[in-house]
Structures are given as structure tokens and as C-alpha cells.
């Protein structure tokens, strides 16, 4: 047979679906690998073929489209499960071909079990919303294409295991869930259960979104250096260990890159001959403000080291800050008597 352009296993698309729920999976060829869509391919005489490899097996086999109630079917470039079963887990391949052309890609499909509180191994999308912001809406995700617009499904929203009824600042509005002046206590997993009829059967779609309330843009600031500061003097004798923490507070800024670094006499630590160790740690507040600490240490400090200029620098998308550490050599402890 002719050579086939094999795009391999597309692990970027780790598709997870819940057991005993409908699932519609589009062939990734048309979304990520080929320049044309299914309609163009089909009208050009190309055929889309599906097959799969069961979990823990090596053998590729055709998908059985003759199951009772058409449990698995194909419609254009979509593979349908109505509904899924646990043993549908495996690697699925869609192949587009005719007598002269062939292109295929495989992708993993995992059918996941959930408990009555929607706990599962499913990875949930995270929706970040700004604290105290007026209104945030989240929409029940990935339900498009499951039922026609003429069908009005019922939607029930849950926070964790609790149905959202009379929550003071969270209001279910069909497919949307509105948050009014959100607080950190609104953090959590929010689940919509969409129920719709099809051919005399009721199907359920379960979708969960993790809500994380984060600092507001109105509170965003340039980095604030807590340490070093003008109040603390690092007074050492030669031979002692010098330890200077650079502690910087970064308010949450969406997609900001927060940086902290030291310079010694204007140079990066890697560019000086001093034997310096730098250790970094990061902690986060409830609203994802970040405190980043870089500890500069010199095991056995020399008189020259104590004359150097140690500066902590910090940067985020709002600006930059720098602060020099006050380092000096300890006196010998003698004090001359004052003569009048």
C-alpha cells in the first residue's frame, strides 16, 4: 500500500471524557495538521477512516460502528460515543485517504470515572477571576455540538458537592454562572450538569471549572523590596558567613514574569570571582500575590567582599526596583576614651 503521512501520537491532545456520558471527538487532522477542512477533503474524494488500539494492547483494530443503539458512530469528522464505557479508553487514529494520498494521526482517549461529588482524575480548566471585581461569568464549557439549538437542556450548577441555590454572590443563569464581587472563599470547583433528551433517552454532560480568585489589576504595583533595607546593616568579620536575603513582594498580575536577581559591584554573581551561593524560594498569598526570596551567601567572607556593593534587583510588568544591602566590616570593639 502507499506510504501514509503518519503524524504519530498527538499527546498534546490528552482527551478525557467521563464514563457513561456522551462524547464527541473531532479528528485532530483538520484542526492541527492539515491546511484544509473536512468538507474540502470529502468533496475531493478523500475518506475518513477511524480505528483504535485498546489500552495495554498493541493491535490496531477497526472501531465497531454496529453496536446496539449506535453507541459509537461517526458523523463527518466527529467520532461520537452515546455514551462512553470505561473500556473505550485507548489510542484512537483517524486516517484520511484515497488511492493516492494518505494522512493519519493518533490521539489518546481516557474514559474517567467520577463519584457522586464529581471527584475524579479529570484535569479541569482553571478560570481566574479578579477579587472584588464587579461581575465575573463562567460558562459551562465544551457542550457545543451535543444538541441542536432547538433543544433547551436543563442545567444544574454545583460548588463541590453542593447545588448552588441561594448562594449570596453566585447566581446560576442557565449555561452561565455569575459571581458578584468575588472573594477568596469563592475559590473551588464548580460543576455544571447539562441534561438533554435525544431519541427518547436522557443524556448528562458533566463539566467542571476550577475558579481561582486572584489580585485585581487595580492593586497591581511594581515590585516592593522588603529586604535588604536601610534599617539592617550586615556587619561581619572576615572569615564569617555573610547571608543577605533579598525578599520581594509582587502583586498578582496576569501573565506577568516576575524576576529577582543580585548584582555584586554591578555584575551578575556568575561574572564575579567570589564564591557565592544563591538560593531562591517562592511563596504565594491567597490571591496569588508572590513573595520571592533570593538568599545570597558567602561562606567565608573576605575584607574585599565586605567592601563590595551588593544590590538586589526586581522586575515585573509594572516596573523595576533595586535596593543595596548595607555591608560593612566589624570594628575591633575598642573605643578610645574621649579627651576634653
Amino acid at each position: 500500500s502507499e506510504r501514509c503521512d503518519d503524524w504519530g501520537l498527538d499527546t498534546m491532545r490528552q482527551i478525557q471524557v467521563f464514563e457513561d456520558e456522551p462524547a464527541r471527538i473531532k479528528c485532530p487532522l483538520f484542526e492541527h495538521f492539515l491546511k484544509y477542512n473536512y468538507s474540502t477533503a470529502h468533496s475531493s474524494g478523500l475518506t475518513l477512516i477511524w480505528y483504535w488500539t485498546r489500552q495495554d494492547r498493541d493491535l490496531e483494530e477497526p472501531i465497531n460502528f454496529r453496536l446496539p443503539e449506535n453507541r459509537i458512530s461517526k458523523e463527518k469528522d466527529v467520532l461520537w460515543f452515546r455514551p462512553t464505557l470505561l473500556n473505550d479508553t485507548g489510542n484512537y487514529t483517524c486516517m484520511l485517504r484515497n488511492t493516492t494520498y494518505c494522512s493519519k494521526v493518533a490521539f489518546p482517549l481516557e474514559v474517567v470515572q467520577k463519584d457522586s461529588c464529581f471527584n475524579s482524575a479529570m484535569r479541569f480548566p482553571v478560570h481566574k477571576m479578579y477579587i472584588e471585581h464587579g461581575i465575573h461569568k463562567i460558562t459551562c464549557p465544551n457542550v457545543d455540538g451535543y444538541f441542536p439549538s432547538s433543544v433547551k437542556p436543563s442545567v444544574t450548577w454545583y460548588k463541590g458537592c453542593t447545588e448552588i441555590v441561594d448562594f449570596h454572590n453566585v447566581l446560576p443563569e442557565g449555561m452561565n454562572l455569575s459571581f458578584f464581587i468575588p472573594l477568596v472563599s469563592n475559590n473551588g470547583n464548580y460543576t455544571c450538569v447539562v441534561t438533554y433528551p435525544e431519541n427518547g433517552r436522557l443524556f448528562h454532560l458533566t463539566r467542571t471549572v476550577t475558579v481561582k480568585v486572584v489580585g485585581s489589576p487595580k492593586d497591581a504595583l511594581p515590585p516592593q523590596i522588603y529586604s535588604p533595607n536601610d534599617r539592617v546593616v550586615y556587619e561581619k568579620e572576615p572569615g564569617e558567613e555573610l547571608v543577605i536575603p533579598c525578599k520581594v513582594y509582587f502583586s498578582f498580575i496576569m501573565d506577568s514574569h516576575n524576576e529577582v536577581w543580585w548584582t555584586i559591584d554591578g555584575k551578575k554573581p556568575d561574572d564575579v570571582t567570589v564564591d557565592i551561593t544563591i538560593n531562591e524560594s517562592v511563596s504565594y498569598s491567597s490571591t496569588e500575590d508572590e513573595t520571592r526570596t533570593q538568599i545570597l551567601s558567602i561562606k567565608k567572607v573576605t575584607p574585599e567582599d565586605l567592601r563590595r556593593n551588593y544590590v538586589c534587583h526586581a522586575r515585573n510588568t509594572k516596573g523595576e526596583a533595586e535596593q543595596a544591602a548595607k555591608v560593612k566590616q566589624k570594628g575591633n570593639g575598642c573605643t578610645e576614651p574621649m579627651t576634653l
Epitope: 461581575i135 449570596h168 472563599s185 487595580k218
Partner: antibody, heavy 118, light 107 residues
Framework: EVQLLESGGGLVQPGGSLRLSCAAS????????AGWVRQAPGKGLEWVSA????????LYADSVKGRFTISRDNSKNTLYLQMNSLRAEDTAVYYC???????????WGQGTLVTVSS | EIVMTQSPATLSVSPGERATLSCRAS??????LAWYQQKPGQAPRLLIY???TRATGIPARFSGSGSGTEFTLTISSLQSEDFAVYYC?????????FGQGTKVEIK
Amino acid sequence: EVQLLESGGGLVQPGGSLRLSCAASGFTFEHSSAGWVRQAPGKGLEWVSAISYDGEGTLYADSVKGRFTISRDNSKNTLYLQMNSLRAEDTAVYYCARFRYYTAFDYWGQGTLVTVSS
Amino acid sequence: EIVMTQSPATLSVSPGERATLSCRASQSVSSNLAWYQQKPGQAPRLLIYGASTRATGIPARFSGSGSGTEFTLTISSLQSEDFAVYYCQQYNNWPWTFGQGTKVEIK
């Protein structure tokens, strides 16, 4: 210096309406969420309503929901509380206060007395 | 809604003595608890936020502690100007709720 100055209180009959205002100065009003807290004579404090800094989000205590409306005009640095269908139990000193999630109600006005009586 | 319960309702203390006020939440409010002082005819004044952080200009004799459901406001050595009503308030969940208040009076 931060200042919040309420006005608009007074005597009103049951079923009547009143509009309270709160003029803010000394801080960036448009960056501050705000709210109203009331205190019935000889009683404790009761949160009434809140509004987000952008004016889009509003919340109300169950006791006033559907009757009171909070709003703000950031260009005038002013917070409002429109009170309709007033009842005798709405009689109280009404305080406007700035709030932040991190510090709660950190600045308060001096209060304005609303008396609902026939 | 979260119910805040303060105890005692009234606390009689001599000037210079220590006063300890308690506040209990019906469910966890994390550290999102504030304490206010109110004197007759005046607006409340923020003393403590975040359960233990003193607000700007508040003397060091006022301290707050606790997290979750149990909180304490301590006034280490009562001054004459400290005799007032003290309210706790949770701002973890909407609706924000206040305790019924503790009156600190001169013994």
C-alpha cells in the same frame, strides 16, 4: 485625609422613599469598593449593601433585597443608596464605608439617621 | 449566612487591667476577621483586620489572634479612652456579618 460624608437622611413615612449620598475624598474612590452598614437605635451593626469599585457588581442583605439599590458615580466620587418601600424596621443610622477584601471596612462616614415612622 | 457570636456581652474592667474579648464564627472564616471599636454617637473605627494585623494608627496595646472559628481581641492595659463597644466582623463570605458586640465598661 480620608473623608466619607453621608447626607440625605431624615423622617419618612412607611412605604416612602429616600436617597442617601456619600461624598468621598482623600483616596482613589474609583479603585475602592464601598458599602452601607446600618445601626438601629441601641442595636448592633448590620451590613446592608456593597458595590464593586467598577460599579458593576452589587450585593444586598436579604432584609433589603428588592427595595434598596446601591449605585455610585466615580466621576463625582459619590456613593448612593436608593431606599424604597421603607419600613419601620429600616429606622437606623446609615454609615457608608470603604472596604477592601484585605482590610474589611477601613474607613467610615459619620452616619446619617433615617427614621421611618407615621 | 455565617453567624458571629461575641462573648461576654458586657465586660467590666478596671483601668490598667487586661481585657479579653471573644468572637466565634459558625463556620470557618479563615483569617478574614476584623475588630471595630465604637464609642457613643460615633462611627465604628477599624482596629484589627486579618485577625491579627493592627490598622493604621492603632496603639500596640490592641492585639488580635485566632483563625478559623475562634478569635480573640486583647487590650493589654485598658486606658480611659478604650471603654466602648467592640464588634467583630467576618469578611470571608457574603453576606459580611457582625457579632452583636461586647461592651467594655469601667469596673
